[in-house]
């Protein structure tokens, strides 16, 4: 025997209390598939969340974050505070990257500068809190008579503060 509820389309629910007739989802609720026995409550985008897509009878609302925050998690389940470039978010708020680390985005953590010497390369441009070091050609690649500008001092080992 076919389940009578299977005939109920998205945007409706199969009403147990009314001989399994298909009733429309009430306001602030939705069913995105057919044959549902309940409509689900629409997500509400409040506080630091803002509505990216309104809820309809067949699809849930979608949220993003207000300016100064960015989405985290599946479907933007959380909003996390933005920091400036050169900072990372800690429990105590935005903090500058430690010496030897950088962050070139408004989110995420400070990452260690690239260690050019591991690839046998020299440091062409020193790293900052906002930018990674730029590695240049290996010293052996520098042809005789090339620019006599002294290359910048190598970056210190990543993650360590000055003594």
């Amino acid at each position: 025997l076919q389940d009578p509820c299977s005939n109920c389309p998205a945007g409706t629910f199969c009403d147990n209390n009314r001989n399994q007739i298909c009733s429309p989802c009430p306001p602030n609720s939705f069913s995105s598939a057919g044959g549902q026995r309940t409509c689900d409550i629409c997500r509400q985008c409040k506080g630091v969340f803002r509505t990216r897509k309104e809820c309809s009878s067949t699809s849930n609302a979608e949220c993003d974050c207000t300016p100064g925050f960015h989405c985290l998690g599946a479907g933007c389940s959380m909003c996390e505070q933005d920091c400036k470039q050169g900072q990372e978010l800690t429990k105590k708020g935005c903090k500058d990257c430690c010496f030897g680390t950088f962050n070139d985005q408004k989110r995420g953590i400070c990452r260690p500068w690239t260690n050019c010497s591991l690839d046998g390369k020299s440091v062409l441009v020193n790293g900052t809190k906002e930018r990674d070091v730029v590695c240049g050609p290996s010293p052996a690649d520098l042809s005789p008579g090339a620019s006599s500008v002294t290359p910048p001092a190598p970056a210190r080992e990543p993650g360590h503060s000055p003594q």
């Epitope: 629910f13 009403d15 147990n16 209390n17 602030n28 598939a33 309940t38 689900d40 409550i41």
Partner: antibody, heavy 121, light 106 residues
Framework: QVQLVQSGAEVKKPGASVKVSCKAS????????MHWLRQAPGQGLEWIGY????????NYNQKFTDRATLTADTSTSTAYMELSSLRSEDTAVYYC??????????????WGQGTTVTVSS | EIVLTQSPDFQSATPKEKVTITCRAS?????IHWYQQKPGSSPKAWIS???NLASGVPSRFSGSGSGTSYTLTINRVEAEDAATYYC?????????FGQGTKLEIK
């Protein structure tokens, strides 16, 4: 008869997590939504969120979005509520309650017996 | 969120007296549900969708109201009605409850 049986009392330290279970019997588990609520000592009722066991869809009180996780195991007709980063203010009796989503009136017609969670260092 | 405010917080009544508990919403709601809770027990479904008595609830109880004002009335109160009563809404997320009205029978 329709019954919701919850797991036993828990004592936890601040910062820990707790997972409370709610075993349903006497009805078709996937036809109803399962809600979680709490009641602090001498206080009123506060809604945490709900899960639709049929689809796994969850909807949370925004106050609990980042700390509560609701799940359901349809093979055992059991719903679970996990609350993380516990603090002393989370000391309360936690209830599961069934709602006949089919009525779309979101009314809690059957309640579990409650699980006391105490958060203390 | 919609705030529900019950009045009074506490009511003392004598048997056979008429008791009225009010639940006011900060914004208009479609309907209100009521629950009864006795000390040490879980809440019990009492009245759904403003006026529908739950199974086993005595007919001396009734519910009414619309918009932002709802009432639970006990026509001739009895000793067994001593409990705390809560109203609840879901017209807007999240579900919210009133703070409760404690009814004492002298």
């Amino acid at each position: 008869q329709v019954q919701l049986v919850q797991s036993g009392a828990e004592v936890k330290k601040p910062g820990a997590s707790v997972k409370v279970s709610c075993k349903a019997s006497g009805y078709t588990f996937t036809f109803y939504t399962m809600h979680w609520l709490r009641q602090a000592p001498g206080q009123g009722l506060e809604w945490i969120g709900y899960i639709n066991p049929s689809s796994g869809y969850t909807n949370y009180n925004q106050k609990f979005t980042d700390r509560a996780t609701l799940t359901a195991d349809t093979s055992t007709s059991t719903a679970y509520m996990e609350l993380s980063s516990l603090r002393s203010e989370d000391t309360a009796v936690y209830y599961c309650a069934r709602s006949d989503g089919s009525s779309s009136k979101w009314y809690f017609d059957v309640w579990g017996q409650g699980t006391t969670v105490t958060v203390s260092s | 969120e919609i705030v529900l405010t019950q009045s009074p917080d506490f009511q003392s009544a004598t048997p056979k007296e008429k008791v009225t508990i009010t639940c006011r919403a900060s914004s208009s709601v479609s309907y209100i549900h009521w629950y009864q809770q006795k000390p040490g027990s879980s809440p019990k479904a009492w009245i759904s969708a403003t006026s529908n008595l739950a199974s086993g609830v005595p007919s001396r109880f009734s519910g009414s109201g619309s918009g932002t004002s709802y009432t639970l009335t006990i026509n001739r109160v009895e000793a067994e009605d001593a409990a705390t009563y809560y109203c609840q809404q879901w017209s807007s997320n999240p579900f919210t409850f009133g703070q409760g009205t404690k009814l004492e029978i002298k």
